[in-house]
């Protein structure tokens, strides 16, 4: 099933992202990039020794799978 445009309410984005399902929206340059090939380590479980990464999106601005979703570290990436 094709996913419709995904919306972003952070970082001054005026409109839904035009990305197709296989793409991710890169907030630094504000355009879609292929993300299906990226190796994304799983987020550390709660209680891990180092603090969980705090994303710059506020909870009410969460995107993707839903509010409270952990950020996935992508070493280097894109």
């Amino acid at each position: 099933m094709r996913r419709g445009p995904r919306s972003l309410r952070g970082r001054d984005a005026p409109a839904p992202t035009p990305c197709v399902p296989a793409e991710c929206f890169d907030l630094l340059v504000r355009h879609c990039v292929a993300c299906g090939l990226l190796r994304t380590p799983r987020p550390k479980p709660a209680g891990a020794s180092s603090p969980a990464p705090r994303t710059a999106l506020q909870p009410q601005e969460s995107v993707g799978a839903g509010a409270g979703e952990a950020a996935l570290p992508l070493p280097g990436l894109l």
Partner: antibody
Framework: EVQLVQSGGGVVQPGRSLRLSCAAS????????MHWVRQAPGKCLEWVAV????????YYGDSVKGRFTISRDNSKNTLYLQMNSLRDEDTAVYYC???????????????????WGQGTTVTVSS | EIVLTQSPSSLSASVGDRVTITCRAS??????LNWYQQKPGKAPKLLIY???SLQSGVPSRFSGSGSGTDFTLTISSLQPEDFATYYC?????????FGCGTKVEIK
């Protein structure tokens, strides 16, 4: 060990060219975005350029646009900076660095540079 | 271009002191602010990302706070190895920009 080892610096005359290299090891280079950053003697850090993991996108700082080219060879795990029409003000220590990002849902968030090379000195002088 | 202004440009402190460095952005950058430490002749080292997240391996005496335009790096108890220059950097938009640094010297 995650490492970036740089080479290619030196003394060059104004108007000439130079190519810097940055050899990566200890991580999946082909999945990593990369930057060049420079620091003139006694000055602030200045971002030079960034390249996507697959080379599909490149962005440059205004001061080098049209003169410098960032590129990469993923088969050799190496990043390059081709510097043409060099000027006195390009004299600096040049660093390569890995782009640090996180994926939240379908959005890629940028958090700076988490691995740096040792730096290589470029001196532009007649 | 987003301009980052750091203050002070230098400071003198003693081992054990609490040190605070500020970084102000010329426009709102949400929490896309990172802090680096650089020692003479060495490459910068990432300390804090996303304004307040401690990079792996960095001692917990380092902390960051702020959002929007005003940010702070705090060293709770200065150690001998902390004497260095500290830079802020925004990753909100290209061109990426850095502050001009705060040099922490021994009093």
């Amino acid at each position: 060990e995650v490492q970036l080892v740089q080479s290619g610096g030196g003394v060059v005359q104004p108007g000439r060219s130079l190519r810097l290299s940055c050899a990566a090891s200890g991580f999946t280079f082909s999945s990593s975005g990369m930057h060049w950053v420079r620091q003139a003697p006694g000055k602030c850090l200045e971002w030079v350029a960034v390249i996507w993991y697959d080379g599909s996108n490149k962005y440059y700082g205004d001061s080098v646009k049209g003169r410098f080219t960032i590129s990469r060879d993923n088969s050799k795990n190496t990043l390059y900076l081709q510097m043409n029409s060099l000027r006195d003000e390009d004299t600096a220590v040049y660093y390569c660095a890995r782009r640090f990002t996180m994926l939240r849902g379908w959005y890629i968030e940028d958090y700076g540079m988490d691995v740096w090379g040792q730096g290589t000195t470029v001196t532009v002088s007649s | 271009e987003i301009v980052l202004t750091q203050s002070p440009s230098s400071l003198s402190a003693s081992v054990g002191d609490r040190v605070t460095i500020t970084c102000r952005a010329s426009q709102s950058i949400s929490s896309y602010l990172n802090w680096y430490q650089q020692k003479p002749g060495k490459a910068p080292k990432l300390l804090i990302y996303a304004a307040s997240s401690l990079q792996s391996g960095v001692p917990s005496r380092f902390s960051g706070s702020g959002s929007g335009t005003d940010f702070t790096l705090t060293i709770s108890s200065l150690q001998p190895e902390d004497f260095a220059t500290y830079y802020c950097q925004q990753s909100y938009s290209t061109p990426l920009t850095f502050g001009c640094g705060t040099k922490v010297e021994i009093k």
